[in-house]
Amino acid sequence: ESLGTEQRVVGRAAEVPGPEPGQQEQLVFGSGDAVELSCPPPGGGPMGPTVWVKDGTGLVPSERVLVGPQRLQVLNASHEDSGAYSCRQRLTQRVLCHFSVRVTDAPSSGDDEDGEDEAEDTGVDTGAPYWTRPERMDKKLLAVPAANTVRFRCPAAGNPTPSISWLKNGREFRGEHRIGGIKLRHQQWSLVMESVVPSDRGNYTCVVENKFGSIRQTYTLDVLERSPHRPILQAGLPANQTAVLGSDVEFHCKVYSDAQPHIQWLKHVEVNGSKVGPDGTPYVTVLKTAGANTTDKELEVLSLHNVTFEDAGEYTCLAGNSIGFSHHSAWLVVLPAEEELVEADEAGSVYAG
């Protein structure tokens, strides 16, 4: 089943003339109807190029959606076609006509030709269920860390008031189907699962129905589990720096870690002309490490003041936790004070990477 599906019941044709400009026409059609919206030019004058818009998005013509300058036709209408339609002048985006369309599961009754009566007969007083806030139901995937609580909601309305039931992976879902049970609030159109576990993953469908029809929405739940890992260092940090003699420099290192990380700043040095020891380990000096009153935030920044030529070289941010270590390095180039900034930029690019 795809993420977020709505069930559609199909069934036949009504045409509605446009309202006076500035008014909003409330229209109800039966499932399967051909919805025809008419928008004659105001005052009978020339129309100019127009565009039809549904819920703020321009409609794209298709075999089912027929777009004309003064008329929109949607064949074989379904719940998905419910929404706010408007006809606008293409250049100015001025709204010429505005319609609120609701497609119910109740097939239209009466004479096909009698479009206006059709819309009135179906009425808003009685009818199939519809979502009260469809724009808030566009999120279809919920990813939740294990042990937290999940709430799915499908607020709806209809006359008579619809009932709501829930499916998991297409099958009836009841409290006994999960350890810890479920909590239902029919007045809030909600399903609550406390302390979710990986076995709660799946597709959850709310089915809202009354005697005139039914609608449904499917959500997917993913339960996330924590896998321990060594610290993760943000890519690109610390960054290579070029500084003028006597200026101040800051290196930054962003550390992500589940277990409390231990952060150190190291500077690579030479010993007897060699950068590495016999075992291949680089020679380093520790510039900054955790102290009694040092916060992680402070350790993520290495500040060098009044830099000298001796400060030039390679710097490493080393982060470790109970799982392992990670490190990123960057270079500092120190230029004589009299050199131009342009040259400094060029020098920086030499050391990049």
């Epitope: 999120k139 294990a146 937290n148 999940v150 709430r151 996330l224």
Partner: antibody, heavy 127, light 107 residues
Framework: EVQLVESGGGLVQPGGSLRLSCAAS????????ISWVRQAPGKGLEWVGR????????NYADSVKGRFTISADTSKNTAYLQMNSLRAEDTAVYYC????????????????????WGQGTLVTVSS | DIQMTQSPSSLSASVGDRVTITCRAS??????LAWYKQKPGKAPKLLIY???FLYSGVPSRFSGSGSGTDFTLTISSLQPEDFATYYC?????????FGQGTKVEIK
């Protein structure tokens, strides 16, 4: 069984620092959060801040922002409240509470619920 | 910040009484509201979350209702162990804020 045990409270002078610990057990620490709530003598409850272990994020009340820092060592299942630049008005019993999220498909926010609380530790700021 | 105002601040009742405490938010918090009970010298205990959901292990005489800005905690039949201070708390806005508390005393 879920348990939260605070420690580290005591008497400190204005401007001083103190670090409180909250040792947690009986639940998956890295999936949930720890909130700190305080209660001044004879007063109501005041939310201080929250550590959310899943992404390591923290949130603070305006009254403590910049002075208090919440952190955690997930290998020890322990959360910390580092309190600097303490003031007389910080005098209170400090509670840590296990915090879980209610993730609602319909809402943009996550509702946070504090369901298990420690016994509290008293912090007195006085000269 | 969202202000939470409880009423009454205190009330006297007898065992077996039906008790109602209200909580009003200064702005819409949907159903993001919890109720806590606290006895002197003890830590608070969660009773209700999401305005109307009874937390596990809490007696069914406690119930919560409301959404938006107006909420109610009801104790259908007051028991001796229910004499305590009750707090509401919202967590839709930052920071989370508590009401000032309602003290339920023995009449």
């Amino acid at each position: 069984e879920v348990q939260l045990v605070e420690s580290g409270g005591g008497l400190v002078q204005p401007g001083g620092s103190l670090r409180l610990s909250c040792a947690a057990s009986g639940f998956p620490f890295t999936s949930l959060g720890i909130s700190w709530v305080r209660q001044a003598p004879g007063k109501g409850l005041e939310w201080v801040g929250r550590y959310w272990a899943w992404d390591g994020s923290t949130n603070y009340a305006d009254s403590v922002k910049g002075r208090f820092t919440i952190s955690a060592d997930t290998s020890k299942n322990t959360a910390y409240l580092q309190m600097n630049s303490l003031r007389a008005e910080d005098t209170a019993v400090y509670y840590c509470a296990r915090t879980y999220g209610i993730y609602d498909i319909y809402e943009k926010y996550t509702e946070y619920v504090m369901d298990y609380w420690g016994q509290g530790t008293l912090v007195t700021v006085s000269s | 910040d969202i202000q939470m105002t409880q009423s009454p601040s205190s009330l006297s009742a007898s065992v077996g009484d039906r008790v109602t405490i209200t909580c009003r938010a200064s702005q819409d918090v949907d159903t993001s509201l919890a109720w806590y009970k606290q006895k002197p010298g003890k830590a608070p205990k969660l009773l209700i979350y999401s305005a109307s959901f009874l937390y596990s292990g809490v007696p069914s005489r406690f119930s919560g209702s409301g959404s938006g800005t107006d909420f109610t905690l009801t104790i259908s039949s007051l028991q001796p162990e229910d004499f305590a201070t009750y707090y509401c708390q919202q967590s839709t806005g930052h920071p989370q804020t508590f009401g000032q508390g309602t003290k339920v005393e023995i009449k």
